[in-house]
Interface confidence: medium
Amino acid sequence: APTSSSTKKTQLQLEHLLLDLQMILNGINNYKNPKLTRMLTFKFYMPKKATELKHLQCLEEELKPLEEVLNLAQSKNFHLRPRDLISNINVIVLELKGSETTFMCEYADETATIVEFLNRWITFCQSIISTLT
């Protein structure tokens, strides 16, 4: 059974992930971002189900495409380089889901824009955090 300290650690990691995802969303939604229209043409795979930490496997597989889109933006709205930003997210995701997970991600039939994708995972983080508090 999870201890109170491990639950707290998980909660902090989820909050960190949530902030990183929100930072990306805020950066690309900035009204001064001239490349938003082009960024919205990129398609992302959405998880069929995202209710448990193991489902973060679906986010992990989409981190490389996410970084590619952020490289396209070359936005001054981010304090970190895309590589560093996504690398930070990757570290958190690996710790949360476990690096040796055998879960096989299933994706929904419909793809999504980067905004929809980020909102989905932001909602996921908020949902899990609410169950821990």
Epitope: Y45, E61, E62, E67, E68, S87, C105
Partner: antibody
Framework: EVQLLESGGGLAQPGGSLRLSCAGS????????MSWVRQAPGKGLEWVSG????????YYADSVKGRFTVSRDNSRNTVYLQMNSLRAEDTAVYYC?????????????WGQGTLVTVSS | QSALTQPPSVSGAPGQRVTISCTGS?????????VHWYQQVPGTVPKLLID???NRPSGVPDRFSGSKSGTSASLAITGLQAEDEADYYC????????????FGRGTKLTVL
């Protein structure tokens, strides 16, 4: 022990096709991204193509884009490289390699390689 | 033309220290991507020597070490031995390239 076994190499004519297979064992196959790396005779290593654990995302080097297709069947623990419109410059040993993770990992396991020769 | 530049060859006497450089640019090593090193002994399959976090797989002696600074990386081999004679490749990622994976052209190490 991680094992990767390639097959399907051989002689093909320019413009012809070949399909390479790579069977993986000793690890949870679907949890790993896989790539194909080739080495022309007496030359260095060249990354060819990659595919994520689910198979939803595929990546290609410019030199093979539109001609090669990577795919995988996780129920059979196998990854494939369909090579069409082959050229003489595609002649090489093709290695199947396992990535350490989905996100910009390193190639931690290599197969023995299969030789593809494109010649008329 | 590879996005990562390595010297074609280096050499050293047994017991010496040699370094192999891997020079990139702001779109690969300089962008923060890790650099990985592989060793290929003549007639054999390449094998991972050092990963981007500086870790060595089991069986790789601690005589091998990697470092990175700015847009360059280097592999250092101390206490050179005859069995170290091989080709060495650096590998990273480049967001300007399709697929983004990139290898250096390789460096032939000769033990004198």
């Amino acid at each position: 022990e991680v094992q990767l076994l390639e097959s399907g190499g051989g002689l093909a004519q320019p413009g012809g096709s070949l399909r390479l297979s790579c069977a993986g064992s000793g690890f949870t196959f679907s949890s790993y991204a896989m790539s194909w790396v080739r080495q022309a005779p007496g030359k260095g290593l060249e990354w060819v193509s990659g595919i994520t654990g689910t198979g939803y995302r595929t990546y290609y080097a410019d030199s093979v884009k539109g001609r090669f297709t990577v795919s995988r069947d996780n129920s059979r623990n196998t990854v494939y490289l369909q090579m069409n419109s082959l050229r003489a410059e595609d002649t090489a040993v093709y290695y199947c390699v396992r990535e350490s993770g989905h996100y910009y990992g390193w190639f931690d396991s290599w197969g023995q390689g299969t030789l593809v020769t494109v010649s008329s | 033309q590879s996005a990562l530049t390595q010297p074609p060859s280096v050499s050293g006497a047994p017991g010496q220290r040699v370094t192999i450089s891997c020079t990139g640019s702001s779109s690969n090593i300089g962008a923060g991507y890790n650099v990985h090193w592989y060793q290929q002994v003549p007639g054999t399959v390449p094998k991972l020597l050092i990963d981007g976090k500086g870790n060595r797989p089991s069986g790789v002696p601690d005589r091998f070490s990697g470092s990175k600074s700015g847009t360059s990386a280097s592999l250092a081999i101390t206490g050179l031995q005859a069995e170290d004679e091989a080709d060495y490749y650096c590998q990273s990622y480049d967001y300007m390239l399709s697929g983004s994976v990139v290898f250096g052209r390789g460096t032939k190490l000769t033990v004198l």
